[in-house]
């Protein structure tokens, strides 16, 4: 089930996801001066089965000033049977998704993609917040938000984060890392509530914010 709204806006903060639940959609947006190719996909979709999750569809951008000419590049050997690829396409998601079952990793970039991605999230998705440069975080609790289903409606929990412009000499702007421990989550709302909180993501979040051990390389 898609979340009705976007995650909450926190003044002077941005949010990011570590991984994307199956059902998530990513708009195929192009940077200024480029557009989606005719008959190209409007979005990518995170789909999966019991063994792995992957992004369906390809995003393709072409110059607004020219006809649909896409420069051909040679596919990687393992990709040649699957599809013909062009420089404007986003490569397929790797098959290995074992570390986050039911989730897709970050889709690889595509040529002339817009800088900011627009996702459409599903129930159970978690996003993490940080203050933008020049602001520092005052935490009252977890700096994260989860899309939940309550009484048949979706809503995002409110991240407990305030970003202030008052700089502390010992701190980089917004340097506090997202609170990733399951214990700190406000889960007091229980009536008529269906939640799908991913503690595995939170655990991995805590680890990867320190040092990255597992990486996925996109072919």
């Amino acid at each position: 089930e898609l979340c009705d709204d976007d995650p909450p806006e926190i003044p002077h903060a941005t949010f990011k996801a570590m991984a994307y639940k199956e059902g998530t959609m990513l708009n195929c947006e192009c940077k200024r001066g480029f557009r989606r190719i005719k008959s190209g996909s409007l979005y990518m979709l995170c789909t999966g089965n019991s063994s792995h999750s992957s992004w369906d569809n390809q995003c393709q951008c072409t110059s607004s000033a020219t006809r649909n000419t896409t420069k051909q590049v040679t596919p990687q050997p393992e990709e040649q049977k699957e599809r013909k690829t062009t420089e404007m396409q986003s490569p397929m998601q790797p098959v290995d998704q074992a570390s986050l079952p039911g989730h897709c990793r970050e889709p690889p970039p595509w040529e002339n993609e817009a800088t900011e991605r627009i996702y459409h999230f599903v129930v159970g998705q978690m996003v993490y917040y940080q203050c933008v440069q020049g602001y520092r975080a005052l935490h009252r609790g977890p700096a994260e938000s989860v899309c939940k289903m309550t009484h048949g409606k979706t809503r995002w929990t409110q991240p407990q984060l305030i970003c202030t412009g008052e700089m502390e000499t010992s701190q980089f702007p917004g340097e506090e890392k997202p609170q990733a421990s399951p214990e700190g989550r406000p889960e007091s709302e229980t009536s008529c509530l269906v939640t799908t909180t991913d503690f595995q993501i939170q655990t991995e979040m805590a680890a990867t914010m320190e040092t990255s051990i597992f990486t996925t390389e996109y072919q």
């Epitope: 941005t14 570590m18 990793r105 970039p109 002339n112 993609e113 800088t115 990486t215 996109y218």
Partner: nanobody
């Protein structure tokens, strides 16, 4: 003040390896995607590799895929580029770049808002 300082470049023989480092300061390194770009003499600056904010996902230019590995240590505010099986056409100035606040990857120059001063890599045949 945001600062990106590359190091580790040098003169090597074809087939050798090098490890570039980029020390970042003045911003929350663990929250940003990062990337490496390079500029060969007489050519435009080109994308080499990028890594997401978590350090879990990476993407490479076709010309370096399988030979180069990008990584980031969010605890030490450092970006790395491990380069192996170097070729003469890898010669150039290598730049570390910070992705903009809302950018998912440091894939194009438009995605980036801060750059290091660069480190020279020369691969002789």
């Amino acid at each position: 003040e945001v600062q990106l300082v590359e190091s580790g470049g040098g003169l090597v023989q074809a087939g050798d390896s090098l490890r570039l480092s980029c020390a970042a300061s003045g911003f929350n390194f663990g929250w940003h995607a990062m990337g490496w770009f390079r500029q060969a003499p007489g050519k435009e600056r080109e994308f080499v590799a990028t890594i997401t904010w978590t350090g879990r996902d990476t993407y490479y230019a076709d010309s370096v895929r399988g030979r180069f590995t990008i990584s980031k240590d969010n605890a030490k505010n450092t970006l790395f580029l491990q380069m192996s099986s170097l070729r003469p056409d890898d010669t150039g100035v290598y730049y570390c770049a910070k992705a903009r606040e809302r950018a998912t990857w440091a894939y194009s120059e438009d995605d980036c808002d801060y750059w290091g001063q660069g480190t020279q890599v020369t691969v002789s045949s």
